[in-house]
Interface confidence: low
């Protein structure tokens, strides 16, 4: 229903703590360079204003839309043009164009230093002195680096962060307690960031219909006992919620997400038998738990899908009468039977089914034409299954680091024009799929692998879109979202690429590498590996193994030397010479 004051309505629904957190996230995602102190000042002003509207909904400006209120706040920032350049031009526009303009200026790769976790003692001190400010900094730092992070989920991670610090800061060995727990939160949050970016990409590029199809498939897998119309209702709600968050309507998004959780918990009987444990939790944890819920058991007596979608003589009539509903029902029926498939694969099958009906229902004998459609799914199913098998075997053989390197070589050969830092980031993330998915039971591997890879490749596409350099990447990124992963997998060595000149300085290292944490050391080595491939795109696996092994020994030797600097200075040029020779 309509409310006199939208901001008062959201404040009352969300409560002050969540309201402030969401406003901070919103401002941090729009103006990514502003310091925390500046944002928190704005948050307080907006909160005070919301309180006046709660007290009197007829007070001045309380009837304005949240976009208008937020936009006016952002546009009042002094020196906006100095810090943000053309983003300041947005302020000349009226709503809703002004908000659209802000969204277009979100930067997926802001020029910010990597978020450094403070040392355990220092972290606990500042947390204990002012927990609210500490967690506010966390929200700000994550939100500005991930401008599409799903806001209500970020509040959940802040809550987790709070729990970990509350527990560990009383321990004698704070670091031993904090490190693994915060690493786990960070890992989950980073995966959540790329998954949500994919959802926003889907919404931005292909619209609500495409996103809703994704949601129908996902919900049908999770809730195979729910009826189609129930799934449709859930998918419609999830689509609305994600549209709001991707569009910067974070208060409405969080409020609607809480409403959906409430609805699901009130209607467990018609959705899933697995919800009860989630429904006993407080709001943020409840929504998160429902989002991660395990699949319900598939009904035992499901008939063959062929009966309604192939053998029924009325297939073309049903399709013609309500195409979207008929295809939606097909997607629902197929997905609820296949929790072992990725959503991307299910959407490919639905697309294939749709194309078959489009073709066959225009012909003389439709049943004869579409009669073999289910058999024609086979190659579409086999392709990702083989991908999982070969990649998991490679991961088991090489381990995570070695697997990342194999992926890095593969992708540098496919798209050598892409910047080395982007290739290294993508390969490291793609390589993590092994640790994340290959250890799972067989039935869970395919959905885990393919849907994760799709999200990581979306990140590659988003970064490449900013500065397009590879025609092949542009081609894969421009097509349908569900075809991206197969498109990238099918890419081979780019024959049009002119190899990079061999620059000795690219392969020159100093003693500072010795003190780097393991992760940073790996990145240095992987940067060198990508550069080697760019120099010799057709280098064999053995050649690359030789050079990288040599390089690892060189680093190891010099880091153990008494005079490290001297070792790097003298041994470095020898390494470069040997590498050139090995790759000749």
């Amino acid at each position: 229903e309509a409310h006199k004051s939208e901001i008062a309505h959201r404040f009352k629904d969300l409560g002050e703590q969540h309201f402030k957190g969401l406003v901070l996230i919103a401002f941090s995602q729009y103006l990514q360079k502003c310091p925390y102190e500046e944002h928190i000042k704005l948050v307080q002003e907006v909160t005070d204003f919301a309180k006046t509207c709660v007290a009197d909904e007829n007070a001045e400006n309380c009837d304005k839309s949240i976009h208008t209120l937020f936009g006016d706040k952002l546009c009042a920032i002094p020196k906006l043009r100095d810090n943000y350049g053309e983003l300041a031009d947005c302020c000349a526009k009226q709503e809703p164009e002004r908000n659209e303009c802000f969204l277009q200026h979100k930067d997926d790769n802001p020029n910010l230093p990597p978020f450094q976790r403070p040392e355990a003692e220092a972290m606990c001190t500042s947390f204990q002195e002012n927990p609210t400010s500490f967690l506010g900094h966390y929200l700000h730092e994550v939100a500005r680096r991930h401008p599409y992070f799903y806001a209500p989920e970020l509040l959940y991670y802040a809550e987790k962060y709070n729990e970990v610090l509350t527990q560990c800061c009383t321990e004698s060995d704070k670091a031993a307690c904090l490190t693994p727990k915060l690493d786990a939160v960070k890992e989950k949050a980073l995966v959540a960031a790329v998954r949500q970016r994919m959802k926003c990409s889907s919404m931005q590029r292909f619209g609500e219909r495409a996103f809703k199809a994704w949601a129908v498939a996902r919900m049908s897998q999770r809730f195979p006992n729910a009826e189609f119309a129930e799934i449709t209702k859930l998918a419609t709600d999830v689509t609305k919620i994600n549209k709001e968050c991707c569009h910067g309507d974070l208060l409405e998004c969080a409020d609607d997400r809480a409403e959906l959780a409430k609805y699901m918990c009130e209607n467990q009987a018609t959705i899933s038998s697995k919800l009860q444990a989630c429904c006993d939790k407080p709001v943020l944890q409840k929504s998160q738990c429902l989002a991660e819920i395990e699949h319900d058991n598939i009904p035992a007596d499901l008939p063959s899908i062929a009966a309604d979608f192939v053998e029924d003589k009325e297939v073309c009539k049903n399709y013609a009468e309500a195409k979207d509903v008929f295809l939606g029902t097909f997607l629902y029926e197929y997905s609820r039977r296949h929790p072992d498939y990725s959503v991307s694969l299910l959407l490919r099958l639905a697309k294939k089914y749709e194309a078959t009906l489009e073709k066959c229902c225009a012909e003389g004998d439709p049943p004869a034409c579409y009669g073999t459609v289910l058999a024609e799914f086979q190659p579409l199913v086999e392709e990702p299954k083989n991908l999982v098998k070969t990649n998991c075997e490679l991961y088991e053989k090489l381990g995570e680091y070695g697997f990342q390197n194999a992926v890095l070589v593969r992708y540098t050969q496919k798209a050598p024009q892409v910047s080395t830092p982007t290739l290294v980031e993508a390969a490291r993330n793609l390589g993590r799929v092994g640790t994340k998915c290959c250890t799972l039971p067989e039935a869970q591997r395919l959905p885990c692998v393919e849907d994760y890879l799709s999200a990581i490749l979306n990140r590659l596409c988003v970064l490449h879109e900013k500065t397009p350099v590879s025609e092949k990447v542009t081609k894969c990124c421009s097509g349908s979202l569900v075809e991206r992963r197969p498109c990238f997998s099918a890419l081979t060595v780019d024959e049009t690429y002119v190899p990079k000149e061999f620059k000795a300085e690219t392969f020159t290292f100093h003693s500072d590498i010795c003190t780097l944490p393991d992760k940073e050391k790996q990145i240095k080595k992987q940067t060198a590996l990508a550069e080697l491939v760019k120099h010799k795109p057709k280098a064999t696996e053995d050649q690359l193994k030789t050079v990288m092994g040599d390089f690892a020994q060189f680093v190891d030797k010099c880091c153990k030397a008494a005079d490290k600097d001297n070792c790097f200075a003298t041994e470095g040029p020898n390494l470069v010479a040997r590498s050139k020779e090995a790759l000749a």
Epitope: A226, E227, F228, A229, E230, T232, K233, N267, A269, T270, P303, A307, D308, D312, N318, E321, A322, V325, F326, G328, T329, E333
Partner: nanobody
Framework: QVQLVESGGGLVQPGGSLRLSCAAS????????MGWFRQAPGKEREFVAA?????????YYADSVKGRFTISRDNAKTTVYLQMNSLRAEDTAVYYC??????????????????WGQGTLVTVSS
């Protein structure tokens, strides 16, 4: 949106049969579970039968009609049927067709359903 119109009611002798039809208009018929309810004079409306959204879907029945009544649907004709056999005097009522997102919710004591028909009278009497 779905509009529902029932037909097929009438006077029948005990032990006889009737087939009720409910024609739905609206392009999203196959998105809905369909059901039949009845209301006898001076009594509350009660659940009779429901079927999930797709042809050959799962069916649910009230204990009092199990084995005698059969619910079915034809999505091509956007129609739901209630075949009533071995009719008894206590089956006399106005029979209503209904549509909802879920066949299971229809079985609740007083379901608040989004779509109802106007009803068709069934009288079982000798």
């Amino acid at each position: 949106q779905v509009q529902l119109v029932e037909s097929g009611g009438g006077l029948v002798q005990p032990g006889g049969s009737l087939r009720l039809s409910c024609a739905a208009s609206g392009r999203t018929f196959i998105a809905y579970a369909m059901g039949w309810f009845r209301q006898a004079p001076g009594k509350e409306r009660e659940f009779v039968a429901a079927i999930t959204n797709f042809a050959g879907g799962t069916t649910y029945y009230a204990d009092s009609v199990k084995g005698r009544f059969t619910i079915s649907r034809d999505n091509a004709k956007t129609t739901v049927y209630l075949q009533m056999n071995s009719l008894r005097a206590e089956d006399t009522a106005v029979y209503y067709c209904a549509a909802d997102r879920s066949a299971q919710t229809m079985r609740q004591v007083r379901p608040v359903l989004p779509y109802w028909g106007q009803g068709t009278l069934v009288t079982v009497s000798s």
